[in-house]
C-alpha cells in the first residue's frame, strides 16, 4: 500500500491504492547538494545525474572507515524521496547531485557556496526549464551563505532547505534563515512535530511550512533494491522539493513568490499540535503541512496572501521590528504583537522603494513583533494614507480617497506610552466601512490599493466581555489582507493573521475587569480579485 508520507501529501482527489498524481515534474530539474549517492539504485537509476562537483572536508578521526554504502546513504535516500520510481514524490523529475557533504554528513560553508556557484554557472551555460535546488543541510547562521541563496533565488531558482534537527529556532541556522529559501520543518504520521532523540525539528518564523519527515521509506544505498526508513527535516525538505517540481512542471512560469504562496495555500492547516513548540515560538511557527494542489492547473484566480513575522525587536524603549515581503509581493497590511502588551503600534513605511511593516516597542515593554501581510497582486498600485493624531474626541480616521483604491489594511501608531488606558473604546461610524479609525492620540495608516478587479470588505467580530482571543475569518472565496483590533486599548497584545483568520490577542482575562474596557473587536479586511478569476476562466 501507499507509504503514509505520500498519502499525506496527496489530495483526496488523487487517492487510490497507489500514488499516481498527474505529471511527475518532468519539466523540472532538481539539484541535490548532499552526500555522494548510489546512482545505480533501481529507484533512481537514469533519473539522477551525478555531476563531477565535489567539495567536502576530510572525515574526522584516524580510524574512520570509508564505506561506500554509508557515504551514499543520506543523498541516495533523499534522491529517492524527491523522484524515486516507487516511493518518490515527483516521479518524473530529473535530478543532478553535487557532493558537498562527506561520509560523516559534514560539509563546509565554502563548499556549499562553491556548489551554488556551480549551479549558477550551469544555468547560464545551458539554460533549461525551472530549477529547484534542494539543500538538506543546516549549519550555524551564515550571512554569506544566506546572501548566496538570495542571489540564486533572484536569478529565478527555487531553493528548498531543511529547517534543521536541533529543536531550536530555525532563524539561528543557515540556509534555513535565508528569507528567499523555502524552509521546511518535519512532522510525523500523526501530524506532530518530529522528535529525534533528545532533539527534533526546528521551528519558528523562519520555517515556511512542515512536511512528512519521520519514518520516510526511501532508497537505501545498501543495495540496488534496498529500501530504508529515515527521519529528519532533510526528508521533509525533499518532499517539498518534489511538490515544487510538480507545481513547476504544471506551471513553468511560476515565480518563487507565487510558488511559495501556493505551497502555503494548499497546505493542510492547523493540524500540528503546537504544544510541542516552546511557548514563545508557537505564534511564530506556521501550522502548515505541505500537500500537492488538488489539480495540476494553477489557482491563478486566487488572491494569495501569507503572514510574515519579523524578528523580535528587543526590549529597549525605542526598539523597533521590521517585517518585509518578498520582492514580488505587495505589503497589504501591517500589524504588531507584544507579549507584554506594551507596544506603540505599527506603521507601514517606505524603505528602499518598497513598503515595510515597522512595529514600535513601548517603555517597559519586553519587545514587539511586526507582522506583514504579503500578497500576490499583479498590476497593483498601493500607497499608505496617514492621518495624524486628531484633536476631536471622535478619534482619528483615514480613508482611501483616490478613485478606484480600496482599503486593504489599517495600522495605528502612537507616541504616548499609556494610550487608551482610561479611554472609552472607539467605534467606527456606521455606513463608513472603507476607513480606518483609532484613538485620537494615534496616527492611523490606511493601506490603499488599486488593482484590476480588486474588491474588499470589512468584517468585524466584537466580544463585550474580556476574552484572551477574538477571531474573525473571511469566507470562502475571499482572502484576508488586513487584521487589526478595535479599540487600541492597552490590554490588547496585538493582532495577526493566521491563514484566513484575523486573531486579536488580549491579556489574561484574570488581569482585566469586565468593564467596557474588556470589549475587544477583531477587524478583518477581506479581499478578492474578480480580474484574476476572469483571467483564469479564460485560460481554462
Amino acid at each position: 500500500s501507499i507509504p503514509w508520507n505520500l498519502e499525506r501529501i496527496t489530495p483526496p482527489r488523487y487517492r487510490a491504492d497507489e500514488y499516481q498524481p498527474p505529471d511527475g515534474g518532468s519539466l523540472v530539474e532538481v539539484y541535490l547538494l548532499d552526500t555522494s549517492i548510489q546512482s545505480d539504485h533501481r529507484e533512481i537509476e537514469g533519473r539522477v545525474m551525478v555531476t563531477d562537483f565535489e567539495n567536502v572536508p576530510e572525515e574526522d578521526g584516524t580510524r574512520f572507515h570509508r564505506q561506500a554504502s554509508k557515504c551514499d546513504s543520506h543523498g541516495t535516500h533523499l534522491a529517492g524521496v524527491v523522484s524515486g520510481r516507487d516511493a518518490g514524490v515527483a516521479k518524473g523529475a530529473s535530478m543532478r547531485s553535487l557532493r558537498v557533504l562527506n561520509c560523516q554528513g559534514k560539509g563546509t560553508v565554502s563548499g556549499t557556496l562553491i556548489g551554488l556557484e556551480f549551479i549558477r554557472k550551469s544555468q547560464l551555460v545551458q539554460p533549461v526549464g525551472p530549477l529547484v535546488v534542494l539543500l538538506p543541510l543546516a549549519g550555524g547562521y551564515s550571512r554569506v551563505l544566506n546572501a548566496a541563496c538570495q542571489r540564486l533565488a533572484r536569478a529565478g531558482v527555487v531553493l528548498v532547505t531543511a529547517a534543521g534537527n536541533f529543536r531550536d529556532d530555525a532563524c539561528l541556522y543557515s540556509p534555513a534563515s535565508a528569507p528567499e529559501v523555502i524552509t521546511v520543518g518535519a512532522t510525523n504520521a500523526q501530524d506532530q512535530p518530529v522528535t529525534l532523540g533528545t532533539l527534533g525539528t526546528n521551528f519558528g518564523r523562519c520555517v515556511d511550512l512542515f512536511a512528512p519527515g519521520e519514518d520516510i521509506i526511501g532508497a537505501s544505498s545498501d543495495c540496488s533494491t534496498c529500501f530504508v526508513s529515515q527521519s529528519g527535516t532533510s526528508q521533509a525538505a525533499a518532499h517539498v522539493a518534489g511538490i515544487a517540481a510538480m507545481m513547476l512542471s504544471a506551471e513553468p512560469e511560476l515565480t518563487l513568490a507565487e510558488l511559495r504562496q501556493r505551497l502555503i495555500h494548499f497546505s493542510a492547516k492547523d493540524v500540528i499540535n503546537e504544544a510541542w513548540f516552546p511557548e514563545d515560538q508557537r505564534v511564530l511557527t506556521p501550522n502548515l503541512v505541505a500537500a500537492l494542489p488538488p489539480s495540476t492547473h494553477g489557482a491563478g484566480w486566487q488572491l494569495f496572501c501569507r503572514t510574515v513575522w519579523s524578528a523580535h525587536s528587543g526590549p529597549t524603549r525605542m526598539a523597533t521590528a521590521v517585517a518585509r515581503c518578498a520582492p514580488d509581493e505587495e505589503l497589504l497590511s501591517c500589524s504588531s504583537f507584544s507579549r507584554s502588551g506594551k507596544r506603540r503600534g505599527e506603521r507601514m513605511e517606505a524603505q528602499g522603494g518598497k513598503l515595510v511593516c515597522r512595529a514600535h516597542n513601548a517603555f517597559g515593554g519586553e519587545g514587539v513583533y511586526a507582522i506583514a501581510r504579503c500578497c500576490l497582486l499583479p498590476q497593483a498600485n498601493c500607497s499608505v494614507h496617514t492621518a495624524p493624531p486628531a484633536e476631536a474626541s471622535m478619534g482619528t480616521r483615514v480613508h482611501c480617497h483616490q478613485q478606484g483604491h480600496v482599503l486593504t489594511g489599517c495600522s495605528s501608531h502612537w507616541e504616548v506610552e499609556d494610550l487608551g488606558t482610561h479611554k472609552p473604546p472607539v467605534l467606527r461610524p456606521r455606513g463608513q466601512p472603507n476607513q480606518c479609525v483609532g484613538h485620537r492620540e494615534a496616527s492611523i495608516h490606511a493601506s490603499c490599493c488599486h488593482a484590476p478587479g480588486l474588491e474588499c470588505k470589512v468584517k468585524e467580530h466584537g466580544i463585550p466581555a474580556p476574552q484572551e482571543q477574538v477571531t474573525v475569518a473571511c469566507e470562502e472565496g475571499w482572502t484576508l489582507t488586513g487584521c487589526s483590533a478595535l479599540p487600541g486599548t492597552s490590554h490588547v497584545l496585538g493582532a495577526y493573521a493566521v491563514d484566513n483568520t484575523c486573531v486579536v490577542r488580549s491579556r489574561d482575562v484574570s488581569t482585566t475587569g469586565s468593564t467596557s474596557e474588556g470589549a475587544v473587536t477583531a477587524v478583518a479586511i477581506c479581499c478578492r480579485s474578480r480580474h484574476l478569476a476572469q483571467a483564469s476562466q479564460e485560460l481554462q
Partner: antibody, heavy 119, light 113 residues
Framework: QVQLVQSGAEVKKPGESLKISCKGS????????ISWVRQMPGKGLEWMGW????????HYNPMFQGQVTISADKSISTAYLQWSSLKASDTAMYYC????????????WGQGTLVTVSS | DIVMTQSPDSLAVSLGERATINCRSS????????????LAWYQQKPGQPPKLLIY???TRESGVPDRFSGSGSGTDFTLTISSLQAEDVAVYYC?????????FGQGTKVEIK
Amino acid sequence: QVQLVQSGAEVKKPGESLKISCKGSGYSFTDYYISWVRQMPGKGLEWMGWIYPGDSYTHYNPMFQGQVTISADKSISTAYLQWSSLKASDTAMYYCARDRWSRPYFDIWGQGTLVTVSS
Amino acid sequence: DIVMTQSPDSLAVSLGERATINCRSSQSVLYSSNNKNYLAWYQQKPGQPPKLLIYWASTRESGVPDRFSGSGSGTDFTLTISSLQAEDVAVYYCQQYSSFPITFGQGTKVEIK
C-alpha cells in the same frame, strides 16, 4: 485477478525479427517492474533485464545487452521483448515476471512464451 | 555478479520424509538497512512457470503449504520440505534480488524415492 498473460509460441528462422508480449491485468501496471527471464531447454533460469512501465526505463543484464530490446506500452499495460535478428541459440522459453519496491522478488509470472529458432 | 550455488543438484526423498536444499551466495545478501536477506525460493513444475514459495529467506508466500520453510542468513540458506508430498516433485531455485544482475541458483531437482 492479478495476472500476466504472454503471447503464444513462435517458430522463426535465424535472422528474422520477433516481438513477444506480456499483458498485465488486475493491478496498476505502471507501479511494478516487469522482468524477462530466459530458460533454455533443460536448463535453469537467467534474468535478462527489467523495465519500469511508468517511465519505460530499462536495465539489462550485461549478458543480454544489445541482444534484445525490452519495451512497454503503458496505455495497454503491455511489456515486450524483441529481437532484430534471431539466432538458433535464442531457442528457449521466455517468462515475464513482476516485482516492486516493497516486494522485490517475482510474485507473479506469465505462463511463458516458447520461441523456437530453426532453419 | 553474485553467484548462487545450490546443492545438491538432485534429491530423491521418500514420501512423507524431509527434503533439504542448500543455497550459498558468493557475497552476503543480508543488509543492515532493514536487516533482511534478499533471497527467494521458487518451485517450478514441468511445463509450468516458476512459483514463488519463500521470500526474505524465510517468509512463506500466502497460499504456500506450511511444510515449506526457509532459513539461513548472510550467505548460507536452506529450503526445507518437512514432509514430502507427491505434488512437490519439481525443480527448486534460489534467487538473490539485492543487486543486478539478478541471479538464480542452477536448480535442485526433487524426486520421489
